[in-house]
């Protein structure tokens, strides 16, 4: 499956929206920084099959959608930017779903790529636990926003690599 150019653009637009969503200086939240253990190895195109990488992207976008569609998130961010962000994520989910089913088929993908999917879930579980522990403070959300931007940037670079391999 050739990930469409629109998917890469959508990812870039999502990153721009995440950047615009920042409300406070990242520097004022340095004391709240945290290592969430981003599962970089799951997105390593050299080690993993393309289908696995696509599954991991899909799970990452789904979990990002879940994270930013909570009521705690709605209170933290600008509603207009958040709505635009949802639309980008939703579009990306659609692109990836089409890709996933084209590659192998839904059932087989779920079984084949469970390890990479679970790695992404554990990562997002840590993010959720961190937010809960920090009582969803503005700085905690800022740290999470920056973290999601970092993980999106990483996956965008890998997607470029995947397209080149095709």
């Amino acid at each position: 499956c050739d990930l469409p150019q629109t998917h890469s653009l959508g990812n870039r637009r999502a990153l721009i929206l995440l950047a615009q969503m920042g409300r406070i200086s990242h520097f004022s939240c340095l004391k709240d920084r945290y290592d969430f253990g981003f599962p970089q190895e799951v997105f390593d195109g050299n080690q993993f099959q393309k289908a696995q990488a696509i599954s991991a992207f899909h799970e990452m976008i789904q979990q990002t959608f879940n994270l930013f569609s909570t009521k705690d998130s709605s209170a933290a961010w600008d509603e207009t930017l958040l709505d635009k962000f949802y639309i980008e994520l939703f579009q990306q989910l659609n692109d990836l779903e089409a890709c996933v089913t084209q590659e192998v088929g839904v059932e087989e993908i779920a079984l084949m790529n469970e390890d990479s999917i679970l790695a992404v879930r554990k990562y997002f579980q840590r993010i959720t636990l961190y937010l809960m522990g920090k009582k969803y403070s503005p700085c905690a959300w800022e740290v999470v926003r920056a973290e999601i931007m970092r993980s999106f940037s990483f996956s965008t670079n890998l997607q470029k690599g995947l397209r080149r391999k095709d």
Epitope: G37, Q63, L118, A119, R121, Q125
Partner: antibody, heavy 122, light 107 residues
Framework: EVQLVQAGAEVKAPGESLRISCKVS????????ISWVRQIPGKGLEWMVK????????IYNPSFQGHVSISVDKSITTVYLQWSSLQASDTAIYYC???????????????WGQGTLVAVSS | DIQMTQSPSSLSASVGDSVTITCRAS??????FHWYRQKPGKAPELLIY???NLQTGVPSRFTGSGSGTECTLTITSLQPDDFATYYC?????????FGQGTKLDVR
């Protein structure tokens, strides 16, 4: 086949140290959380601690924090529970369990070891 | 900590009967309710996860329902294997907690 195989029973005196093990096989070790659960004979179940074998990130039940420690050895896909100084009240069966994590990030315990009986008596 | 209270604590029934066990949480745990069965001298085994989902390999005579602060486990057409102790669990908040157990024995 997913398996969590625990070490045999241990009889110890108060004040002694102990490490019990749980050897896992049949799946990718680093993909799932592992927890320890205590069951005092004839009583209910108590969750103690969980660990992510990928990088040893841990979450403790405050009731057990400071009294036990959890660790992993990735090279032999084994999880450990350790005491530096046992008490009579540590007498119990200890189960290691694997967590499954759903898309909505709900943990549940889908596979259990057979249990290790630890008896602490003078 | 979130307290989990099971009722009844013990229950007598016969093969072929239907029974219901209830679990109440001291605060809402959404659908983060799970049910386990423990046979004498054995490790617990998962029956139902996320309040109502049947674990693979578990017979369909086991059903779970509920969310929020209350959930139930219903066993229809009891089999000899089902006489055991049943535990509910919540994994919504740390520390994870279990109910005190419901012992199901033969009438």
């Amino acid at each position: 086949e997913v398996q969590l195989v625990q070490a045999g029973a241990e009889v110890k005196a108060p004040g002694e140290s102990l490490r019990i093990s749980c050897k896992v096989s049949g799946y990718t070790f680093t993909s799932y959380w592992i927890s320890w659960v205590r069951q005092i004979p004839g009583k209910g179940l108590e969750w103690m601690v969980k660990i992510d074998p990928r990088d040893s990130y841990t979450i403790y039940n405050p009731s057990f924090q400071g009294h036990v420690s959890i660790s992993v050895d990735k090279s032999i896909t084994t999880v450990y529970l350790q005491w530096s100084s046992l008490q009579a009240s540590d007498t119990a069966i200890y189960y290691c369990v694997r967590h499954y994590l759903t898309q909505s990030l709900v943990d549940y315990f889908d596979h259990w070891g057979q249990g290790t009986l630890v008896a602490v008596s003078s | 900590d979130i307290q989990m209270t099971q009722s009844p604590s013990s229950l007598s029934a016969s093969v072929g009967d239907s029974v219901t066990i209830t679990c109440r949480a001291s605060q809402s745990v959404s659908n983060y309710f799970h049910w386990y069965r423990q046979k004498p001298g054995k490790a617990p085994e998962l029956l139902i996860y996320s309040a109502s989902n049947l674990q693979t390999g578990v017979p369909s005579r086991f059903t779970g329902s509920g969310s929020g602060t209350e959930c139930t486990l219903t066993i229809t057409s009891l089999q000899p294997d089902d006489f055991a102790t049943y535990y509910c669990q919540q994994t919504h908040g740390y520390p994870f907690t279990f109910g005190q157990g419901t012992k199901l024995d033969v009438r």
